[in-house]
Each structure stands twice: as C-alpha cells, then as structure tokens.
C-alpha cells in the first residue's frame, strides 16, 4: 500500500537520477550511480539442519546467505545475525511458514502459539528492541492430516552501522524448511540525511 508506493517513489527517483547520469556523462553522477548499485541488501533462507527443539521462543541462528535464492551484499551475516555495515534507512522483511503433517508425529499440544519476532540489537549501547512481530494462536486438531500457517512482516527502519538483526520464532520444530517458505532480509533504501 502506502509503504510500497513510498518505496517505489524513493527507489524510482534514484534510478531516474542514475539514468540521467548516463545521458549527462557526469562522472560525479556516475559515481553516485555506482554507489546505488552497491546499496546493501540481504536475503537469507532457513538452514533447517540445525533447528532448535523446544516450543518456546528461540533465536534462529542457522541461515543460508549464498545458496539458492539467498544472497548478501555489503552486509554481514555472522553468528546467526544480519549485521548492518552502512547507516541508512532499510526495508526489513521476514516470511515464516509453519507446517505439520501427521507423519511428522503427534503434537504435544494442539493449541499452538505460532509467532515471529524481528529484533534489532545494538552492541555500542547494549540494547535489544523488537522491530516487528506477527503470528497467531492456532488450533491444529489431530483430526486433520495437514496444517499450514504463514506469517509475513515488513517495515521501514533507520539502522546504524554495527546494529544486528535477528529472527526469533516459537515452535521452531514446525518451521517449513523450504527456501521459498522461511526467509528474512533487508535492503537499504536511502541514506540518513
């Protein structure tokens, strides 16, 4: 909606300026254009080989950054966290899919709180803030063969170099391990004025 239009306006105007640089032949504008191409971004997909076993809220630390759809540029992935290298306004997003098939076993409880939390941690001033959360309480009856639930959150945030983004979920054993199902990412939209 409104956020998408604003992003299109910001990103679109930057592309127009970059294209103008080609016409004008200005080296200064060309430098700006190359800077645009180096805008930080990351798209991380779940690495399901090391999923925690509890049902409580846990931090997901295993993500792919360089295989399949996963890519990263001018950001750092370390110890399960996405680290900001450049100050700026970023669009953050996360998509989490939960699923259960009867062949996976019997659920310990049919009432499930399926949640995602996207958190920002600052090292310089030790603090942690939940930037986004989403989810629902579900009743996954044993009478059904298959259950599925998807959460998508996204938002626009001012981030500083060194700040870390992490993702926490409840009931991680229920995560859908496919790269098109469980992922998070960020891309820089503009500098801080």
């Amino acid at each position: 909606g409104a956020v998408q239009k604003e992003l299109q306006h910001i990103v679109g105007s930057q592309h127009i300026r970059a294209e103008k640089a080609m016409v004008d032949g200005s080296w200064l504008d060309l430098a700006k254009r190359s800077k645009l191409e180096a805008q930080p971004f990351a798209h991380l997909t779940i690495n399901a080989t090391d999923i925690p076993t509890g049902s409580h809220k846990v931090s997901l630390s295993s993500w792919y950054h360089d295989r399949g759809w996963a890519k990263i540029s001018n950001m750092t992935f370390s110890n399960g966290k996405l680290i900001v290298n450049q100050d700026g306004f970023y669009y953050l997003y996360a998509n989490i899919c939960f699923r259960h098939h009867e062949t996976s076993g019997d659920l310990a409880t049919e009432y499930l709180q399926l949640m995602v939390y996207v958190t920002k941690t600052s090292i310089k001033i030790p603090s942690s803030h939940t930037l986004m959360k989403g989810g629902s309480t579900k009743y996954w009856s044993g009478n059904s063969e298959f259950h599925f639930y998807s959460i998508n959150v996204g938002g626009f945030f001012k981030l500083r170099s060194g700040e870390e983004i992490s993702v926490e979920v409840s009931n991680p054993s229920l995560l859908d391990p496919d790269q098109d199902a469980t992922y998070f990412g960020a891309f820089k939209v503009r500098d801080i004025d």
């Epitope: 076993t53 509890g54 049902s55 409580h56 310990a108 409880t109 009432y111 009931n171 054993s173």
Partner: antibody, heavy 122, light 107 residues
Framework: QVQLVQSGGGVVQPGRSLRLSCAAS????????MHWVRQAPGKGLDWVTV????????HYADSVKGRFTISRDNSKNTLYLQMSSLGPEDTAVYYC????????WGYGMDVWGQGTTVTVSS | DIQMTQSPSTLSASVGDRVTITCRAS??????LAWYQQKPGKAPKLLIY???SLESGVPSRFSGSGSGTEFTLTVSSLQPDDFATYYC?????????FGQGTKVEIK
C-alpha cells in the same frame, strides 16, 4: 549446565500419599514436555506419565491412572508427581526426564534427574 | 499397549567387538524408537532417537536402524565404558513403553 534435581522420596505406608518434585535449570523449562519414569529394584524401566510443555496435555500409564497426578509450575521451573493410594508395587526409584522435543511426542528423553527412591512398606 | 521385546537379555562380549541388540515391537511404531544406556545406580542416558538419529555428544560407534516393528542398536567397536544395560523405548499414540533391557557384560 542443564540439570534436573529431584526431591521428595522416602518411606510411606500403603494407601498413603507422597509428592515428588523435580527442579529444572540450564534450559527453558517452559518449552519442553516432561516425563516421570520409574525403576523397581533390580528391574527395568517403566514409563509412568508425561505432561506437555504448557501443561495442557497429560498422559498416564494404565497402572497409575486415577492414582497419580503430574503437574508443573513453569514460573518455578518445577515438575511434580502427586502419588496417592500407594501400594508395594509402586516401590521404585523415580526419575524425572525432559522430552527431547517440545513440540512433538516420541523423540525420547534427553535429560534425566538423579532419581529419588520411594519405598511403600508397612 | 505395545509390547517391546529385546534380545538377547544378556550379551557377553570383549573390547573391540561389534555388538548388535535387537528390539521388536508388537505392532508398527513407524520410527518412534529410542535407545538408552544405563549403568548401575545411575540414570539412563539417551543414545539414539527416532530409530537412527544419534543424540548430541554420543560417540559415533553407536548407531540405530530399523522401522515398523524391528529395530537394532549397533556398537561398532565395544569400548570399556560401553559395558552397561541398554533399553529400547517406543512411542505410539500417547503411550510410552520400554523393553526389558539387554545387559552387555565382559566376556
């Protein structure tokens, strides 16, 4: 480190009651199902009861149904077993054990308490 | 309830031997089987879960296999620390049962 510390065992007369406790530390207690397993002197392991991570689901072996009650207090990280109408056949070492998976049943028990002895004798 | 039958009840072996213990379920339990090791006066220790998954920290000489009604625990090369009693444990529809145990003793 991850551990379960048990208390509450002892000698009790037939027909009386006893409550066992199991204090958890080193892991998020509220995220895991918990079991009680017993072992009679010189015998094998015998599953007694289980409770889900949130306390909503409880299951019992036929031999203790209606006599034993499992409960938990997640704010105190403690598991309980209330035993009533005790008989000599309940004499055993009782172990509390953590379920390996919090979400699913069936994955086994990966952390065990040290055991506490319950002797039912007149 | 599902009955679990372990064989043999007692097994005499030497250090370095390859040892196999069998566990049979009275009806299919898919892969919902765990193996434990217990030493005298101590609590059991989880070795294998879901029939073949090795528990964290357990030596790789231990392995599990099988599905349905027949399962095996194998110790590829028996070590002095492995002399103990081993139990299988099944899960099926909100019921858990243990096998009667297999004692592995020094030959």
């Amino acid at each position: 480190q991850v551990q379960l510390v048990q208390s509450g065992g002892g000698v009790v007369q037939p027909g009386r009651s006893l409550r066992l406790s199991c204090a958890a530390s080193g892991f998020t207690f509220s995220g895991y199902g918990m079991h009680w397993v017993r072992q009679a002197p010189g015998k094998g392991l015998d599953w007694v009861t289980v409770i889900s991570y949130d306390g909503s689901n409880k299951h019992y072996a036929d031999s203790v149904k209606g006599r034993f009650t499992i409960s938990r207090d997640n704010s105190k990280n403690t598991l309980y077993l209330q035993m009533s109408s005790l008989g000599p056949e309940d004499t055993a070492v009782y172990y509390c054990a953590k379920s390996l998976s919090g979400t699913y049943w069936g994955y086994g028990m990966d952390v065990w308490g040290q055991g506490t002895t319950v002797t039912v004798s007149s | 309830d599902i009955q679990m039958t372990q064989s043999p009840s007692t097994l005499s072996a030497s250090v370095g031997d390859r040892v196999t213990i069998t566990c049979r379920a009275s009806q299919s339990i898919s892969s919902w089987l765990a193996w434990y090791q217990q030493k005298p006066g101590k609590a059991p220790k989880l070795l294998i879960y879901k029939a073949s998954s090795l528990e964290s920290g357990v030596p790789s000489r231990f392995s599990g296999s099988g599905s349905g009604t027949e399962f095996t625990l194998t110790v590829s090369s028996l070590q002095p620390d492995d002399f103990a009693t081993y139990y299988c444990q099944q899960y099926n529809r909100y019921s858990w049962t243990f096998g009667q145990g297999t004692k592995v003793e020094i030959k």
